[in-house]
């Protein structure tokens, strides 16, 4: 068959998915586009085990994930259901805070330095993680 059995070079395999960890920073929309160009998407976190795996690889870095409410409700970029799925927000988050002085609220989610999630201004440049299923990697 045409399915791949291993991840591309510089990608990390975990539980049937391949992950790529950026070493530079970009706004959420640019990070999202980058992943799409790699035939992938911003990481969608579906379990505590996956969360722990990602944390081990990231260290204390604010890092974009594929979760946004730019178009209304919170949605994962791959269509995974948000309401019934795994969530790991910092206490009192998300809060759509307007007090940052950067304009507007906060519509994009990221890993904070302790791994818990926060909503932040989408145009802030953070690191990011791309994910693709193992049989779609190229």
């Amino acid at each position: 068959g045409s399915e791949r059995t291993c991840c591309p070079i510089n990608w990390v395999e975990y539980e049937g998915s391949c992950y790529w960890f950026s070493s530079s920073v970009r706004p959420w929309t640019e990070a999202d586009k980058y992943c799409q160009l790699e035939n992938a998407h911003l990481v969608v976190v579906t379990s505590r085990d996956e969360q722990n795996f990602l944390q081990r690889h990231m260290g204390p870095l604010n890092t974009w994930i594929g979760l946004t409410d730019q178009n209304g409700p919170w949605k994962w970029v791959d269509g995974t259901d948000y309401e019934t799925g795994f969530q790991n927000w910092r206490p009192e988050q998300p809060d759509n805070w307007y007090g940052h002085g950067l304009g507007g609220g906060e519509d994009c989610a990221h890993f904070t330095t302790d791994g818990r999630w926060n909503d932040d201004v989408c145009r802030r440049p953070y690191r990011w993680v791309c994910e693709t299923k193992l049989d779609k990697a190229n």
């Epitope: 722990n52 944390q55 260290g59 204390p60 870095l61 604010n62 910092r90 206490p91 009192e92 988050q93 809060d95 805070w97 007090g99 940052h100 002085g101 950067l102 906060e106 990221h110 904070t112 330095t113 302790d114 791994g115 818990r116 926060n118 909503d119 932040d120 802030r124």
Partner: antibody
Framework: EVQLVESGGGLVQPGRSLKLSCAAS????????MAWVRQAPKKGLEWVAT????????YYRHSVKGRFTISRDNAKSTHSLQMDSLRSEDTATYYC??????????????WGQGVMVTVSS | DIQMTQSPTSLSASLGETVSIECLTS??????LAWYQQKPGKSPQLLIS???NFQDGVPSRFSGSGSGTQYSLKINSLESEDAATYFC?????????FGGGTKLELK
Amino acid sequence: EVQLVESGGGLVQPGRSLKLSCAASGFTFSDYNMAWVRQAPKKGLEWVATIIYDGGSTYYRHSVKGRFTISRDNAKSTHSLQMDSLRSEDTATYYCARQTYFGSRDYFDYWGQGVMVTVSS
Amino acid sequence: DIQMTQSPTSLSASLGETVSIECLTSEDIYNNLAWYQQKPGKSPQLLISYASNFQDGVPSRFSGSGSGTQYSLKINSLESEDAATYFCLQDSEYPPTFGGGTKLELK
């Protein structure tokens, strides 16, 4: 009222060990990342180490990595800093500090009174 | 690591005067800056977070401003209790780094 109380400081010879402890009260300890920050005599402040809320990850400044170990006990609302292979440049007042969880912020919002560590022969 | 350059290192002013302390960062920290006050023999106290949000209980004569790589702390109508050392902190990325401090003395 948030309170952080350090203990365990003192005079120690170079190469020896010392363990600092911090007892926390007045807040939900298991929600917060905790840190140690030090201040050498007449000098500025220097972050030393952080342990995240559940103890799952720890972070250190380069100069103490491999010599210092930060840990926590959420059941007892305490955390500690085990300092091994101490050097004269580790001489400082060590502060236990709570890190905020507000948004993506990590600043230190509450500090203990500090405990002096002197490394000298 | 993000470098923090704080100025001046010391400052002498009279009661009622207004003073400013500057903090320059080696890269854009997107307002992730806090200011602390430390009195001799005491631990630091948080004055301002996120560049301009002052903490509960902090007198309104303290204010913070700035963006990008340039930030400042302003103290209006100095009072005797303001004599202290002031530090800035960036918490934009690890490791957190402090400015070298500004010692404020009252004439």
